[in-house]
Interface confidence: low
């Protein structure tokens, strides 16, 4: 069998709402993927399971099932939507995005997901991490590839 | 209800070609590949290749390359075969076969109702 | 080409008997993603073959459990118990594992 490709492309919107009582910030973020098939029978994409880690902490997850078939030697986009909490112990967060002397509230966010492809049975992972800036301040849509984070350091597996 | 209705038998002369058709119904055409295959009288079944509708990409058993040629209509939801150069030899019935229900594990769930070509002067 | 020969060619079966028709290829038919794609069809006369078995052993859906498949490599076998009426025709088994997919030459099931 032929490889099955998985390209995290970036954070294609974040949608933010707050509750002042409790101090803490909702963020919704869609994602999108390129799934590129190489191989010259149809393969099912069986779920997709993301999380999203700010400062080493899981702030939210998802997972979506049955989401696609993608045929012989094709390539489907596919968005999926990640619901965030950042609140408790990092509601401090919570001043910083809200404060209005500043335009862009830009945090730091790990994104990680992983694909379940599976053909005639056969069931394969592919996981991708990838840092990404995202506005917690206000609500934002992004050109593909324009939240990339770089200049981080990838920890040491 | 998934269904494969295929065209109706063709009588046909030596050396002329015949275009068969396969239309699907209550699916999504486009996602799911079509096989083709051959059974002559009173023999068994021989695997002819596949079409995936949604991209036109086709795969061919080596037999019968050059014989049989693969084609889909996604706005119909109907796939096609043509056998051309015909000879007494393609005398058969033609299914054609689609994996909708076991896409994960098999090759043909979903079978047509056959099409009966008779070559002959 | 893997060649998928079925013994016997013909079954002679009373109704209620067990039957049971072997299908060997002539190679190993385990992919290289560690499946075996052997699978079992009955085709009844005038009609379009019907898929029993996939993956050596599992039946399709709204197959009777009387069916059964079996086996690994190169040696399978579909048991039926209980013959009844309804299961009369050709048996083909079909191995999909390596290209081109290629069927047994079939196996009849009669009445004796």
């Known amino acids: 069998p032929r490889s099955i490709d998985v390209k995290y492309i970036g954070v294609k919107s974040a949608y933010v709402s707050y509750d002042v009582q409790k101090r803490t910030i909702y963020l919704n973020i869609t994602n999108t993927l390129n799934i590129t098939n190489n191989n010259y029978y149809s393969v099912e994409v069986e779920n997709i399971t993301a999380q999203v880690q700010f400062s080493k902490t899981v702030i939210g997850k998802a997972r979506l099932n049955n989401i696609t078939i993608i045929g012989p030697l094709d390539m489907k986009q596919i968005d999926y939507t990640v619901p965030t909490v950042i609140a408790e112990e990092m509601s401090y967060m919570y001043d910083f995005c809200t404060l209005i002397s500043i335009k862009v509230h830009n945090i730091v966010l790990m994104m990680q997901v992983t694909v379940t492809t599976t053909y005639f049975g056969h069931s394969e992972q592919i996981s991708q991490e990838r840092y990404q800036y995202v506005d917690c301040g206000r609500n934002t849509t992004y050109q593909l590839g324009q939240s990339e984070y770089l200049n981080v350091l990838q920890p040491q597996q | 209800q998934v269904q494969l209705q295929q065209s109706g038998p063709e009588l046909v002369k030596p050396g002329a070609s015949v275009k068969i058709s396969c239309k699907a119904s209550?699916?999504?055409?486009?996602?799911?590949?079509i096989h083709w295959v051959k059974q002559r009288p009173g023999q068994g079944l021989e695997w002819i290749g596949w079409?995936?509708?949604?991209?036109?990409?086709?795969n061919y058993n080596e037999k019968f390359k050059g014989k049989a040629t693969l084609t889909a209509d996604t706005s119909s939801s109907t796939a096609y075969m043509q056998l051309s150069s015909l000879t007494s030899e393609d005398s058969a019935v033609y299914y054609c076969?689609?994996?909708?229900?076991?896409?994960?594990?098999?090759?043909?769930?979903?079978w047509g109702t056959g099409t009966t070509v008779t070559v002959s002067s | 080409d893997v060649l998928m020969t079925q013994t016997p060619l013909s079954l002679p079966v009373s109704l209620g008997d067990h039957a049971s028709i072997s299908c060997r290829s002539g190679?190993?038919?385990?992919?290289?993603?560690?499946?075996?794609?052997l699978e079992w069809y009955l085709q009844k006369p005038g009609q379009s073959p019907k898929l029993l078995i996939y993956?050596?052993?599992n039946r399709f859906s709204g197959v009777p459990d009387r069916f059964s498949g079996s086996g690994s490599g190169t040696d399978f076998t579909l048991k039926i118990s209980r013959v009844e009426a309804e299961d009369l025709g050709i048996y083909y088994c079909?191995?999909?594992?390596?290209?081109?997919?290629?069927f047994g030459g079939g196996t009849k099931l009669e009445i004796k």
């Open positions: 079409i995936y509708p949604g991209n036109g990409i086709t």
């Open positions: 209550g699916y999504r055409f486009t996602s799911y590949y």
């Open positions: 993956k050596v052993s």
């Open positions: 190679q190993s038919i385990v992919h290289s993603n560690g499946n075996t794609y």
């Open positions: 076969a689609s994996p909708y229900y076991g896409i994960r594990n098999c090759y043909f769930d979903v």
């Open positions: 079909f191995q999909g594992s390596h290209v081109p997919w290629t």
